[in-house]
């Protein structure tokens, strides 16, 4: 039968009875071998029945005495089988065996759950020699037990290549419940049920769980560990914890905050990183995400011109990297820009609107209605045009660039003229007779040169011809205008 000792019981005497060989209580050990020094606790569990050897693993010596009497089987004496104690208490337990003096070099090793205990454990072996036998007591002490000390301890002794093994001593360290799973913080949808889990273990078992929400107990009736709490939904943030109770007392888990997902706060600090004639690069600082990751953002762009129709352009983009290049804008224009971002719950309000302007650009269209005619009397080519629409000038006109290409008998020569912005006509000298002159005109702003107009061709005859009609930019759909004389 297993003997059980509880911490409430009186400590057993260190050595309650005589061994064979009539070990007297006033004997002092001949040799004491500490395996590791350490505090020896007051609470000790020692053999309760040192008499009968157990029937477990025994070694039967082959050697006989002078009288040829066989020696009795060697075995560890029975000791306490089960020790129950509280965490942080001290404990001492031992194995004892009587070994005939004919054996030398007997050593006792301690094992826990099948593994030898080496190193800094508080193990001491004491030898009590007598005429025929030596009583050996191997003591093992733990100054402050922890849960990890739970287990089955045995002694082993090697004699004549035989191994003698003691009965196990079961150490059960009891304490307050220990959490193996605690509730975790979560972000949840408003008024939607969710689960929290709490698990704690002893010993001692059972462990009962109580849930606490915002310092109010959820279940007045305990649930056995593990416990899953279904929270029926929240309308505002709440703090949850669980209490684990056993016979030793209670342990309270960490409190976890459960947040309610909401629409995000509007972005802040919308700023202009860079402006060009037709694009604006903006950045923003995201607002609070409402406990739900941002999905995407929307950039809203309005013309700031009071005469505009007030329509809003919307550009959608990913939430990262809080940067967006707004394209397809007009040059030299003012815009109001706002940013809104969304999570799974919905869209934030729009950020404070900021004003931004595009820079001057090169004109986006060419001058219109280009006409070319030959003024033979002055040997010039007269060019006339209409300036591009103001909206499409993309800036303030500073002038025009005229390209005229002269082609004759396999020779081609291009010349460029710059003219001021005032007026819409120019005159260029005839460069080559009996040749074709091809004219194109582009508007120029400080932002650059715009596109050239479609080419207008005029034939310059040899000297002596009369009467010339003008050549002009064709109506849409016609290609390569040529003046027929």
């Amino acid at each position: 039968a297993i003997t059980e000792a509880r911490e409430e019981a009186k400590p057993y005497p260190l050595f309650p009875g005589p061994f064979p060989g009539s070990l007297q209580t006033d004997h002092t050990p001949l040799l004491s071998l500490p395996h590791a020094s350490g505090y020896q606790p007051a609470l000790m569990f020692s053999p309760t029945q040192p008499g009968r050897p157990h029937t477990g693993n025994v070694a039967i010596p082959q050697v006989t005495s002078v009288e040829s009497k066989p020696l009795p089987p060697l075995a560890f004496k029975h000791t306490v089988g089960h020790i129950i104690l509280s965490e942080h208490k001290g404990v001492k337990f031992n194995c004892s065996i009587s070994v005939p003096n004919i054996y030398q070099d007997t050593t006792i090793s301690w094992w826990k759950d099948g593994k030898e205990l080496l190193g800094a454990h508080h193990a001491i072996t004491q030898f009590y020699p007598d005429d025929e036998v030596t009583a050996i007591i191997a003591s093992f002490s733990i100054t402050s037990v922890q849960r990890s000390d739970n287990g089955s301890y045995i002694c082993k002794m090697k004699i004549n290549n035989e191994e003698i093994v003691s009965d196990p001593i079961y150490i059960e360290v009891q304490g307050l419940p220990h959490f193996t799973k605690q509730p975790e913080s979560m972000n949840v949808t408003r008024n939607t049920a969710f689960n929290l889990t709490c698990q704690a273990v002893g010993p001692p078992e059972p462990v009962n769980i109580f849930w606490v929400q915002n310092s109010s107990r959820v279940n007045e009736q305990p649930e056995k560990s593990p416990s899953v709490l279904t929270v029926p939904g929240l309308t505002e943030m709440a703090v949850f914890s669980c209490e684990a109770h056993n016979d030793k007392g209670l342990t309270v888990s960490k409190g976890v905050q459960i947040n309610i997902k909401a629409i995000p706060s509007p972005p802040t600090e919308v700023s202009i990183r860079n402006s060009t004639a037709h694009s604006i690069l903006i950045s923003w600082v995201p607002g609070f995400d409402g406990y739900s990751p941002f999905r995407n953002c929307s950039i809203q762009v309005k013309e700031a011109d009071p005469l505009s129709n007030g329509s809003v352009m919307i550009f959608n983009t990913s939430a990262l990297p809080h940067l967006y290049q707004i394209k397809q804008l007009q040059a030299l224009a003012n815009y109001s820009i706002g940013v809104s971002c969304m999570n799974e719950i919905g869209w934030s309000a729009v950020s404070p609107w900021i004003l931004a302007s595009t820079t001057e650009g090169a004109p986006s269209v060419a001058p219109l209605n280009v006409t070319v005619f030959l003024n033979e009397s002055s040997d010039n080519v007269d060019i006339r045009w209409m300036k591009p629409p103001t909206k499409q000038q993309d800036g303030e006109l500073v002038g025009y660039r005229i390209s005229h290409v002269w082609q004759s008998a396999g020779i081609s020569k291009e010349l460029l003229e710059e003219v001021g912005q005032n007026g819409s006509r120019a005159r260029i000298s005839v460069q080559v007779h009996n040749a074709t002159c091809t004219v194109r005109i582009a508007a120029v702003t400080r932002g650059g040169v715009g596109p050239f107009s479609d080419p207008v061709k005029i034939f310059i005859p040899a000297h002596g011809w009369v009467d010339y009609a003008p050549s002009s930019t064709p109506a849409p759909g016609n290609a390569d205008p040529v003046l027929i004389i």
Epitope: N191, S216, E220, Q221
Partner: antibody, heavy 118, light 106 residues
């Protein structure tokens, strides 16, 4: 299905005692608390307290401490309400109700009318 | 203890109409539960934890609110809905009931 069946009506004289029973079926009796609720004639509902069916420990609200005793016989899944030294103002319908998380009374007995009259 | 005040004390409506019953707590509560009681019968759980429909309760019943103000709404009254309705708070012991709202046929 979950059922709470209460004992029948009682007519008692002032100073006497009465014991009302509430037998539960259709669920594990010791997994849920058992509450008692009083409703005086023409009045609203008053929570009297509850008994922990796991530990047997009763809890009484302030107005029901003293003459009121909650008890259990878990072997027959039955809860009891005993009222001693009955007074005329104890005349009411007494309900037992299963008591679950968040203080929800999800199943109710049919009620027991206790009349105290000389 | 938390006092629950239900209003109105009596509400007279016709079948098919919408009913809105109010329950106000003297201080913040965690959840509100609602019960229906018909004459000679035990109360029956309708809504638990403010907005959750109890088993077997028709979807025309709904609950809302938070903090101290809670509402039970019956979207379209049926003849069997005329009864007394009680709110009950969770969040502070002792749990308390409101005085009830009697919903009667106009």
């Amino acid at each position: 299905q979950v059922q709470l069946v209460q004992s029948g009506s009682e007519l008692k004289k002032p100073g006497a005692s009465v014991k009302v029973s509430c037998k539960a079926s259709g669920y594990i009796f010791t997994s849920y608390g058992l509450s008692w609720v009083r409703q005086a004639p023409g009045q609203g509902l008053e929570w009297m307290g509850w008994v922990n069916t796991y530990s047997g420990v009763p809890t009484y609200t302030d107005d029901f401490k003293g003459r009121f005793v909650f008890s259990l016989d878990t072997s027959v899944s039955t809860a009891y309400l005993q009222i001693s030294s009955l007074k005329a103002e104890d005349t009411a319908v007494y309900y037992c109700a299963r008591y679950t998380n968040y203080g929800v009374f999800d199943y109710w007995g049919q009620g027991t009318l206790v009349t105290v009259s000389s | 203890e938390i006092v629950l005040t239900q209003s109105p004390a009596t509400l007279s409506l016709s079948p098919g109409e919408r009913a809105t019953l109010s329950c106000r707590a003297s201080s913040t509560v965690g959840y509100m539960h609602w019960y229906q009681q018909k004459p000679g019968q035990a109360p029956r759980l309708l809504i638990y934890a403010t907005s959750n429909l109890a088993s077997g309760i028709p979807a025309r019943f709904s609950g809302s609110g938070s903090g101290t103000d809670f509402t039970l709404t019956i979207s379209r009254l049926e003849p069997e809905d005329f009864a007394v309705y009680y709110c009950q708070q969770w969040g502070s012991l002792p749990f308390t009931f409101g005085g009830g709202t009697k919903l009667e046929i106009k």
